[in-house]
């Protein structure tokens, strides 16, 4: 149609990603969003301190991790982002009231084995899954 | 080993989940935090709003939705949450300074289809994949 | 020049309904998000329901999920509000509200947040007698 070979001429004009690297250069030089951005941080859970020390024999604990950081415009490719969080991102960038930015989670988990009692007393050793942080992402 | 038996027979006493029942009526009975509980929320993106008009041929925008709100203890079930975040979220809750709330994201993606123009301006259908949030939980 | 007009509120008993009603003029109603407050005294404005009129979503406040139902006649430019199953608490006074889909067709409901929207009608009341 004649939209669509406007539209494609105008391409050559307009790249696709134009408005993007213009945004990416005003978000680069904004020095107004300093937060460390999206990342595995260490965090060592005590079975105890969650009060759960006396149904779990062991491990006392386990390094869980956490994810936290910034997820702002543009994504780096490191981040892990799906494609629902570039465009979120994007959304977000154009107009903050629209939806928030996506936010840092867990995109690799990994299992812990735990030996404890159940309720009649018995020993169990159990494989948890989806317990320690292996990688975080933007979603 | 009678630390073992001393622990087992703490259990009657001390069921595994009172600390948690305990925590969950003073997290229940808080009013401080009235937030709306994580879930998927309604948004429609504009291809123009992002400045792919140009490239993007059809369809004109899609509906994305996005996931916001609380990831507070105690989690319920419907929040899909990992163990990892049940995990966090009781180490939050135990101490806020330690760690975040786990945050509201995406569980399940759906793909959509793109008629878009390539470098070379030939028209070009593809499947977008983790385009539509499907579901939402704790992470 | 966006103008809104609401009609229909009044004094109605616990458990009864009434039907809201916000006339429209001044814009394209299909580009706009139209939105129902509410604000008893001394209380916040808050927003309980939104619709997009073009694609028929909707949003709707917990204090409200199952009970109200918004919808619109786009013929007419008009945005209703069934409330059903009123409550003493549900009194307040009613305000219609508008904006824009920014700037040409992404939106979100973002809990019908009130600095989203820019037009807002002089509001109805409605009183719930118990």
């Known amino acids: 149609s004649t939209g669509s070979k406007q539209r494609s001429q105008n391409r050559s004009k307009t790249p696709k990603n134009q408005e993007a690297l213009r945004m990416a250069n005003v978000a680069e030089n904004s020095s107004s969003d300093q937060r460390q951005a999206c990342k595995k941080h260490e965090l060592y859970v005590s079975f105890r301190d969650l009060g759960w020390q006396d149904w779990i024999i062991a491990p006392e604990g386990y390094a869980a991790y956490y994810c936290e950081g910034e997820c702002a415009f543009p994504l780096n490719s490191y981040m892990n982002a799906t494609n629902h969080a570039i465009v979120q991102t994007l959304v977000h960038f154009i107009n903050p009231e629209t939806v928030p930015k996506p936010c840092c989670a867990p995109t690799q988990l990994n299992a812990i084995s735990v030996l404890y009692f159940d309720d009649s007393s018995n020993v169990i050793l159990k494989k948890y899954r989806n317990m320690v942080v292996r990688a975080c992402g933007c979603h | 080993s009678t630390g073992s038996k001393q622990r087992s027979q703490n259990r009657s006493k001390t069921p595994k989940n009172q600390e948690a029942l305990r925590m969950a009526n003073v997290a229940e009975n808080s009013s401080s935090d009235q937030r709306q509980a994580c879930k998927k929320h309604e948004l429609y993106v504009s291809f123009r709003d992002l400045g792919w008009q140009d490239w993007i041929i059809a369809p004109e925008g899609y509906a994305a939705y996005y996931c916001e709100g609380e990831c507070a203890f105690p989690l319920n079930s419907y929040m899909n949450a990992t163990n990892h975040a049940i995990v966090q979220t009781l180490v939050h809750f135990i101490n806020p300074e330690t760690v975040p709330k786990p945050c509201c994201a995406p569980t399940q993606l759906n793909a959509i289809s793109v008629l878009y123009f390539d470098d070379s301006s030939n028209v070009i259908l593809k499947k977008y994949r983790n385009m539509v949030v499907r579901a939402c939980g704790c992470h | 020049e966006v103008q809104l007009v609401e009609s229909g509120g009044g004094l109605v008993q616990a458990g009864g309904s009434l039907r809201l009603s916000c006339a429209a003029s001044?814009?394209?109603?299909?580009?706009?998000?139209i939105g129902w407050f509410r604000q008893a005294p001394g209380k916040e404005r808050e927003g309980i329901s939104c619709?997009?009129?073009?694609?028929?979503?909707?949003y709707y406040a917990d204090s409200v999920t199952g009970r109200f139902t918004i919808s619109s006649d786009n013929a007419n430019n008009t945005v209703y509000l069934q409330m059903n199953s009123l409550k003493p608490e549900d009194t307040a006074v009613y305000y219609c509200?508008?904006?824009?889909?920014?700037?040409?067709?992404?939106?979100?409901?973002?809990?019908?947040?009130?600095?989203?929207?820019?037009?807002w009608g002089q509001g109805t009341q409605v009183t719930v007698s118990s």
């Open positions: 001044g814009f394209t109603f299909d580009d706009y998000i």
């Open positions: 619709i997009s009129s073009s694609d028929g979503s909707t």
């Open positions: 509200a508008a904006h824009a889909k920014w700037p040409y067709g992404t939106y979100s409901f973002r809990r019908c947040r009130r600095a989203s929207f820019d037009s």
